[in-house]
């Protein structure tokens, strides 16, 4: 049975503006034309869906308008960006890839990217 391996970086540090980007790469066992990518956050054994997008190979990734994620795709590689992160959002972000069409369906799950978010220090009041 052909496996679908998903690779993602082990650790990413969010920017001071609360933006984190990482690449999710999958080794496709078939010639998929429709792919679904889901970002899951695992913290304290709780798993929540951060965002999800389905895209046609060769087309752009489209997340819902109110999503905190954006992304681009290139071949079997998806560049994901998560915005609006705060220190409390630090956790393991797992990339889940599903080959939706044509059959057969394949599921691949990455080991997760630990995203560290440090809230910026508030600017001290300036004395003029």
């Amino acid at each position: 049975c052909k496996a679908m391996h998903v690779a993602q970086p082990a650790v990413v540090l969010a920017s001071s503006r609360g933006i984190a980007s990482f690449v999710c790469e999958y080794a496709s066992p078939g010639k998929a034309t429709e792919v679904r990518v889901t970002v899951l956050r695992q913290a304290d054994s709780q798993v929540t869906e951060v965002c999800a997008a389905t895209y046609m190979m060769g087309n752009e990734l489209t997340f819902l308008d109110d999503s905190i994620c954006t992304g681009t795709s290139s071949g079997n590689q998806v560049n994901l960006t998560i915005q609006g992160l705060r220190a409390m959002d630090t956790g393991l972000y797992i990339c889940k890839v599903e080959l939706m069409y044509p059959p057969p369906y394949y599921l691949g799950i990455g080991n997760g990217t630990q995203i560290y978010v440090i809230d910026p220090e508030p600017c001290p009041d300036s004395d003029f």
């Epitope: 496996a3 679908m4 679904r36 939706m100 057969p104 369906y105 599921l107």
Partner: antibody, heavy 118, light 108 residues
């Protein structure tokens, strides 16, 4: 809590049709793949079909492909199985099952019995 | 298409004994996408193990799963009266999803 309640089973003659429904509650229905799994009397479990998320993608077992159609209405949190050209070997309890985040089947309905007999 | 074979078909044991159930796949199961379910008469199946070795929420630690590739095992360390049931393995993660034929654990 997650609940899956099937309905629509009954006795039907070979060659006829039947439509099963599954009312889901306690979770965000559109975020999960939904399956039908059946079990003939005294036999093992057999996967029948799956429908993914928005309903655009569906996959079927060879035994039912071309005769059964899986569908969903995310606005009503309901899963369906339209069964046409029914055969005696389709007699089974049909379970509505949620495909969990990690891919395995995590919640099952109690099932509805379909009996195909003349 | 992967075929799962479970053995033995029936296992006759006494409460307190150890039960070892086997699930063998005709091809390697990718990413250990293998789950175990328990089913009692008139009830829906109940998830015990996923990912070959991870216990589902609320499952007692006397249930454990092991294995990889083509050979998987469900072990019940000490059988309790409520453990006598039929056990199925499931290969997931790729369609078609496949169940094993089941192993019945009954009271000796």
């Amino acid at each position: 809590q997650v609940q899956l309640v099937e309905s629509g089973g009954g006795v039907v003659q070979p060659g006829r049709s039947l439509r099963l429904s599954c009312a889901a509650s306690g979770f965000t229905f559109s975020s999960y793949g939904m399956h039908w799994v059946r079990q003939a009397p005294g036999k093992g479990l057999e996967w029948v079909a799956v429908i993914w998320y928005d309903g655009n993608n569906k996959h079927y077992a060879d035994a039912v492909r071309g005769r059964f159609t899986i569908s969903r209405d995310n606005s009503k949190n309901t899963l369906y199985l339209q069964m046409n050209s029914l055969r005696a070997e389709d007699t089974a309890v049909y379970h509505c099952v949620r495909g969990g985040i990690w891919g395995y089947f995590d919640y099952w309905g109690q099932g509805t019995l379909v009996t195909v007999s003349s | 298409e992967i075929v799962l074979t479970q053995s033995p078909g029936t296992l006759s044991l006494s409460p307190g004994e150890r039960a070892t159930l086997s699930c063998r796949a005709s091809q390697s199961v990718s990413s250990n996408y293998l789950a175990w379910y328990q089913q009692k008469p008139g009830q829906a199946p109940r998830l015990l193990i996923y990912g070959a070795s991870s216990r589902a929420t609320g499952i007692p630690d006397r249930f454990s799963g092991s294995g990889s590739g083509t050979d998987f095992t469900l072990t019940i360390s000490r059988l309790e009266p409520e453990d006598f049931a039929v056990y199925y393995c499931l290969r997931y993660g790729t369609s078609p999803f496949t169940f094993g034929p089941g192993t019945k654990v009954d009271i000796k």
